[in-house]
C-alpha cells in the first residue's frame, strides 16, 4: 500500500506571455497521493470551474484561457491540497502582449498659416508602441516646432505652408506596426496681393488691361470694384497657377475711374481679404468729352457595381474632401459622358474607366491601389475605342470639346506598368479577356499605329494579331 | 528585355559597410516595385526590402535600421547600404523586381563579411 | 511573420515521373475581396538564380513550360511538376507576397534518377 505523500509542485508556474484572442496554458504538476484537489484563482479570486472562458485539465493541473482578453492580467495560482501536510500553492503573471493598435487616429485637418495644429494618434498595445510619423514618403524629423508629444499626437507650432501634405501615424512594438489611413493636412493662407495693379493715363477710346495677382489657400477669387460699383463693363480673364491666381481686367476705357482689385478666401466661416486699387486717368480729359496617399474600403457605389468585383476592395484618394461621394461623382459624370460612344467603345471604356477611378487594392507591404496594366488601357485606346480615342484627340488639337471621351477621367496609357514587366503590379480587365475571346470580328479601325500593333494581351485564341516589335516596358 | 544588374559587393570586416547597386533597363523602372533578397551559401532564399513606386521602404526585422533600400528613377539604379555587418549577412544578393511576386531576379552580388 | 513549411525537403524521380510539392502556410495568404492567394513558386537550378514560375497560386508565369502546374488556396498550396524532365532537377521555393515581411519556404530539392 501506497504511504500518503503531502502535495508537492513539480513544475513551479512560470510568467507566460499571450497575445489577445490566442491561448494561454499555466501548467501545475503535482506529485502527492492521495490525489490532489486543484484549484486556481486570478489576482486571489478562486476560479470557478464552470467559467467557460477557462479550461481545466489533467486533474486540475493544465490551467487554459481559451481566448485571451486584455483583461487577463494578472497573477494566477494553483493550490493543491490532498489533506496530508498542507496546502501548496505555485504562482505566475500572465503579461498580455498586444499588437499596435491606433484607438484614436489622426483626422484631416485644416489650419491657419501661423497656428499651432495639433493630428491625434491614440495607441494601445503591449509592449507599448512607439510611435512615429510619415509625411508623404518620408519619415517626419522633429524640429524646434514639430513634434510628437508622449500622447503620440503630432504638434507643429507656427504652421507654415510647407507643413500641408499627407500624414500618417505609425505604432510599432515588438510585435508589429500598425499604421492610420492618411490624413491631409491643409494650411490655410490669408488673401495677399503680390501684384496690385498700376494706374493708367490714356486716351479716350484706348483698351487697358489692369492686372491683379494674388496668392492664399484656398486659393483667393478676385472681384474687381469701379468706382465702388461691381465693374459693369469689361472683360475678366483669370489663371490659377501654384496657389497664384492671376486677374486681367480687360477695359475700354471713356471715362476715367477708380479700380480696385480684392482678394477673398475663406477660412471656415471667416473670410480674409485684401485689397488693391489704380486709377485710370485719360490725357486731356476736360477738351475731349469722348486680361494630387488614402485608404482601401469595399466599393459601395452603384455606376460600377457591375464592372468591379464582387466585394471589391478598392481605392479611396484621400486628396478629395470626401473620397467615397467624389469619386462616385467624378464616374457618375464620366457614364453619362459614355452614352455618345459607340456599343464596341462603350463597355470596354466603362471597364477601364470604374477600374482607373476605383483602383484595385492590393495586399504586400501594406494595402495599395493597383494600376491597370498598359496593355488593357491600350487595348481600349487603339482596339475598341480606336475612333472615339482619334476624334478624341483631333478635338483637343482644335480646340473642340464637344460630347464623347474628352471630359473622361482616363489614365494615361503609357504611365501604367506593364503585365509583361510584372504581372502583379497592375490590374486586368476581365471584360477585355472575355471579349477576345467571343468577339470573332472587329470592325476596321482607321488608326495612327499598324494593325498588327494592337497591344498584346494574355495569349489566346483571339483576333489581337501582335506585333513582337511592340514595346512594353 | 528586363536586365538588373547588381554590383558593389565585396570582402568587408564585421562593423563594416557596403554600398550595393542594380542599374535597371528594359522596363520604365518609376513604374515598378523593387526588391532585395539574399542568399547564404548553400542556404535558402531571404527577402530582405522592398521598396514601392512613391521610395517608400519595408524591411525584414533581421536587417531592419542596419540596412536602407533607396531608388533613383532618373538613374535607373536601385541601392541597397549596408551598415553594422555581421559574418551572417554574408551572402549572395540579388536584385529583384516585383510587387507581390519576385518576377525577374539579377544574377547577384557576393557580400562576404569576414575579419 | 508569415510561416511557409514545404514538404518534402528533397525529392527523387525518374524522367516522366509526376512530382508533387506542397507548401503550408502559417497563415491565410488569400484576400477575400479578390480571392486572390498571394502565393508564388520559383525554380532555382544550380549556380543559377531562381526564376518564377507561378504567381497567385496558380496563374503560370509567361514562358514557363506547360507541365509546371500550381493549386491551393487559403493556407494549403501545391506545385506540380507533370512528365519531371532533367532540365528540372533544382531547388524549388514557395513564397508568399500577402504580407510584409515576404517569406519564402525553406525549399525542396528535385533530383533525377
Known amino acids: 500500500e501506497k504511504l500518503p505523500k503531502a502535495p508537492v509542485i513539480t513544475t513551479p508556474l512560470e510568467t507566460v506571455d499571450a497575445l489577445v484572442e490566442e491561448v494561454a496554458t499555466f501548467m501545475c504538476a503535482v506529485e502527492s497521493y492521495p490525489q490532489p484537489e486543484i484549484s486556481w484563482t486570478r489576482n486571489k479570486i478562486l476560479i470557478k470551474l464552470f467559467d467557460t472562458r477557462y479550461s481545466i485539465r489533467e486533474n486540475g493541473q493544465l490551467l487554459t484561457i481559451l481566448s485571451v482578453e486584455d483583461s487577463d492580467d494578472g497573477i494566477y495560482c494553483c493550490i493543491a491540497n490532498n489533506g496530508v501536510g498542507g496546502a501548496v500553492e505555485s504562482c505566475g503573471a500572465l503579461q498580455v502582449k498586444m499588437k499596435p493598435k491606433i484607438t484614436r487616429p489622426p483626422i484631416n485637418v485644416k489650419i491657419i498659416e501661423g497656428l499651432k495644429a495639433v493630428l491625434p494618434c491614440t495607441t494601445m498595445g503591449n509592449p507599448k508602441p512607439s510611435v512615429s510619423w510619415i509625411k508623404g514618403d518620408n519619415a517626419l524629423r522633429e524640429n524646434s516646432r514639430i513634434a510628437v508629444l508622449e500622447s503620440g499626437s503630432l504638434r507643429i507650432h507656427n504652421v507654415q505652408k510647407e507643413d500641408a501634405g499627407q500624414y500618417r501615424c505609425v505604432a510599432k512594438n515588438s510585435l508589429g506596426t500598425a499604421y492610420s489611413k492618411l490624413v491631409k493636412l491643409e494650411v490655410e493662407v490669408f488673401a495677399r496681393i503680390l501684384r496690385a495693379p498700376e494706374s493708367h493715363n490714356v486716351t479716350f477710346g484706348s483698351f487697358v488691361t489692369l492686372r491683379c495677382t494674388a496668392i492664399g489657400i484656398p486659393v483667393p477669387t478676385i472681384s474687381w470694384i469701379e468706382n465702388g460699383n461691381a465693374v459693369s463693363s469689361g472683360s475678366i480673364q483669370e489663371s490659377v497657377k501654384d496657389r497664384v491666381i492671376d486677374s486681367r481686367l480687360q477695359l475700354f476705357i471713356t471715362k476715367p475711374g477708380l479700380y480696385t482689385c480684392i482678394a477673398t478666401n475663406k477660412h471656415g466661416e471667416k473670410f480674409s481679404t485684401a485689397k488693391a486699387a489704380a486709377t485710370v486717368s485719360i490725357a486731356e480729359w476736360s477738351k475731349s468729352q469722348k486680361d494630387s496617399q488614402g485608404y482601401c474600403a469595399q466599393y459601395r457605389g452603384e455606376v460600377c457595381d457591375a464592372v468591379l468585383a464582387k466585394d471589391a476592395l478598392v481605392f479611396f484618394n484621400t486628396s478629395y474632401r470626401d473620397p467615397e461621394d467624389a469619386q462616385e461623382l467624378l464616374i457618375h459624370t464620366a457614364w453619362n459622358e459614355l452614352k455618345a460612344v459607340s456599343p464596341l467603345c462603350r463597355p470596354a471604356a466603362e471597364a477601364l474607366l470604374c477600374n482607373h477611378l476605383f483602383q484595385e487594392c492590393s495586399p504586400g507591404v501594406v494595402p495599395t491601389p493597383m494600376p491597370i496594366c498598359r496593355e488593357y488601357c491600350l487595348a481600349v485606346k487603339e482596339l475598341f475605342c480606336a475612333k472615339e480615342w482619334q476624334a478624341m484627340e483631333g478635338k483637343a488639337h482644335r480646340g473642340l470639346y464637344r460630347s464623347g471621351m474628352h471630359l473622361l477621367p482616363v489614365p494615361e496609357c503609357s504611365k501604367l506598368p506593364s503585365m509583361h514587366r510584372d504581372p502583379t503590379a497592375c490590374t486586368r480587365l476581365p471584360y477585355l479577356d472575355y471579349k477576345k475571346e467571343n468577339i470573332t470580328t472587329f470592325p476596321s479601325i482607321t488608326s495612327s499605329r499598324p494593325s498588327a500593333d494592337i497591344p498584346n494581351l494574355p495569349a489566346s485564341t483571339s483576333s489581337f494579331a501582335v506585333s513582337p516589335a511592340y514595346s512594353m516596358t | 528585355e528586363v536586365q538588373l544588374v547588381e554590383s558593389g559587393g565585396g570582402l568587408v570586416q564585421p562593423g563594416g559597410s557596403l554600398s550595393l547597386s542594380c542599374v535597371a533597363s528594359?522596363?520604365?523602372?518609376?513604374?515598378?516595385?523593387m526588391n532585395w533578397v539574399r542568399q547564404a551559401p548553400g542556404k535558402g532564399l531571404e527577402w530582405l526590402s522592398v521598396?514601392?513606386?512613391?521610395?517608400?521602404?519595408y524591411y525584414a526585422d533581421s536587417v531592419k535600421g542596419r540596412f536602407t533600400i533607396s531608388r533613383d528613377n532618373v538613374k535607373n539604379t536601385l541601392y541597397l547600404q549596408l551598415n553594422n555587418l555581421k559574418p551572417e549577412d554574408t551572402a549572395l544578393y540579388y536584385c529583384v523586381l516585383g510587387r507581390t511576386a519576385l518576377v525577374r531576379w539579377g544574377q547577384g552580388t557576393q557580400v562576404t563579411v569576414s575579419s | 511573420e508569415i510561416v511557409l513549411t514545404q514538404s518534402p525537403n528533397s525529392v527523387t524521380a525518374s524522367v516522366g515521373e509526376k512530382v508533387t510539392i506542397n507548401c503550408k502556410s502559417s497563415q491565410r495568404v488569400q484576400l477575400g475581396s479578390n480571392q486572390k492567394s498571394y502565393l508564388n513558386w520559383y525554380q532555382q537550378r544550380p549556380g543559377q538564380s531562381p526564376r518564377l514560375l507561378i504567381y497567385?497560386?496558380?496563374t503560370q508565369q509567361s514562358g514557363i513550360p506547360d507541365r509546371f502546374s500550381g493549386s491551393g488556396s487559403a493556407t494549403d498550396f501545391t506545385l506540380t511538376i507533370n512528365s519531371v524532365q532533367p532540365e528540372d532537377a533544382a531547388v524549388y521555393y514557395c513564397q508568399q507576397g500577402y504580407s510584409a515581411p515576404f517569406t519564402f519556404g525553406q525549399g525542396t530539392k528535385v533530383e533525377l534518377k
Open positions: 497567385y497560386a496558380s
Open positions: 521598396i514601392d513606386t512613391h521610395s517608400i521602404a
Open positions: 528594359g522596363f520604365t523602372f518609376s513604374l515598378y516595385y
